[in-house]
């Protein structure tokens, strides 16, 4: 058969921050070629990344069409030159990923603050509103745009200081801390979505601190 | 000021499908507020049904979710209910609600601070 | 799903008492997420407090909440004829947000 020199993909993984996904896979090609298929459980499969030598193919545009489903993904080997040729089953080797449930699984970026405000003695502090390529209506929705009230930030606050740390939790953007006047502030935040089973927190943001670029104040 | 006013038939036969509308004036459906459904039943409490952001993004009440949609229509300043499947059960008052930021304890929450007048709907043959 | 108990279901009280109304769920809800309505016959509840102590925008000072993890309290210092309604504490922190049954003030 042409396919003795042709081995199976093996631990296939689903790499996923923000619903852009990756599907990633062993071992690196020798004289063979990889095509991807991916399905939702009652879909058909579309066939991605023809005939490829990489290990790992985007995803992307298919999961976001529906990031609630949960998808099934599977790598065909194929000998390299003669893809035609089929396994003694009559078809190629392949190898089934892990199910997906983009929105249940995807990682959750590292935040950024976008900008706080000193106001006497409160801070409004502002997280970004992180772009997802989720689209709706022709327009790239944001991370709260697609996870709603499920998406919370805590935000980690102290005293420049010190070291003891205090947190506030918003199911918005921004949140209002009161803060000593005169007194110089850091802060970092963390988005979470509690209701899940893995991957409820993302990285921390960068720290930022009060007397910063980003920060303004007013009496 | 915003204001909200639900608006539907009155009467559906079982197994029949619900069909709901709320209108929002006074405001933009999306200025960031989330968007929700809750009934009661004759001489009982408050059950709530859903809720939608203007980007689409839903939540549902689990023991409702395989019978219900919501859906948002951010042209007109409307989002909608539909319930499939209904019986006698779920005859009701009908309310749409918005569902807005207020804060404390260092962030904001969201309540439902501004409520329609509320819909009949009986569900009889 | 958190299920909210109020108690008692009924209160008959004068006009100038003080009512206590108590609200207990079945597992701890974060207090910011825990609200009062009041509901008088054929309209729509009305929100009265939230964050399970803060006064919306136009509530008489009359109206507190207090109370944490599973045990929330409304109370009415000194009713006023108005008053007289019935009264559903809310958690809206866990998918399906849930009501309590109800307390009903009632002139005595």
């Known amino acids: 058969s042409g396919t003795t020199n042709t081995v199976a993909a093996y631990n296939l993984t689903w790499k996923s921050t923000n619903f852009k996904t990756i599907l990633e896979w062993e071992p690196k090609p020798v004289n063979q070629v990889y095509t991807v298929q991916i399905s939702t459980k009652s879909g058909d499969w579309k066939s991605k990344c023809f005939y490829t030598t990489d290990t790992e193919c985007d995803l992307t545009d298919e999961i976001v069409k529906d990031v609630k489903q949960t998808y099934l993904a599977r790598v065909f080997s194929y000998p390299a030159g003669n893809v035609e040729s089929t396994g003694s089953a009559g078809e190629p080797l392949y190898e089934n990923s892990p199910e997906f449930t983009p929105y249940l699984e995807t990682n959750l970026g590292q935040p950024t603050i976008q900008s706080f405000e000193q106001v006497g003695t409160k801070v409004n502090v502002t997280v970004e509103d992180e772009r997802t390529l989720v689209r709706r209506n022709n327009t790239f929705l944001s991370l709260r745009d697609v996870f709603g009230k499920d998406l919370i930030y805590t935000l980690y606050y102290w005293k420049s200081s010190s070291s003891g740390k205090k947190t506030a939790k918003t199911n918005t953007n921004e949140f209002l801390i009161d803060v000593e006047k005169g007194v110089s502030y850091c802060f970092f935040a963390q988005a979470v979505i509690p209701s899940r089973t893995v991957n409820r927190k993302s990285t921390d943001s960068p720290v930022e601190c009060m007397g910063q670029e980003k920060g303004e104040f007013r009496e | 000021q915003v204001q909200l006013q639900e608006s539907g038939p009155g009467l559906v036969k079982p197994s029949q499908t619900l069909s709901l509308t709320c209108t929002v004036s006074g405001g933009s459906i999306s200025s960031g507020q989330y968007w929700s459904w809750i009934r009661q039943h004759p001489g009982k409490g408050l059950e709530w049904i859903g809720e939608?952001?203007?980007?689409?993004?839903?939540r549902y009440n689990p023991s409702l979710k395989s019978r219900v949609t919501i859906s948002v229509d951010t042209s007109k300043n409307q989002f909608s209910l539909k319930l499939s499947s209904v019986t006698a059960a779920d005859t009701a008052v009908y309310y749409c609600a918005r569902d807005a930021p207020y804060y404390y304890g260092g962030g904001y929450y969201y309540y439902m601070d501004v409520w329609g007048k509320g819909t009949t709907v009986t569900v009889s043959s | 799903e958190i299920v909210l108990t109020q108690s008692p279901g009924t209160l008959s009280l004068s006009p100038g008492e003080r009512a206590t109304l108590s609200c207990r769920a079945s597992e701890s809800v974060d207090s910011s997420y825990l609200a009062w309505y009041q509901q008088k016959p054929g309209q729509a509840p009305r929100l009265l407090i939230y964050g399970a102590s803060t006064r919306q925008t136009g509530i008489p000072d009359r109206f507190s909440g207090s109370g944490s993890g599973t045990d929330f309290t409304l109370t009415i210092s000194r009713l006023e004829p108005e008053d007289f309604a019935v009264y559903y504490c809310?958690?809206?922190?866990?998918?399906?947000?849930?009501f309590g049954g109800g307390t009903k003030v009632e002139i005595k």
């Open positions: 809310q958690q809206a922190g866990v998918v399906p947000y849930t």
């Open positions: 939608i952001y203007y980007s689409g993004s839903t």
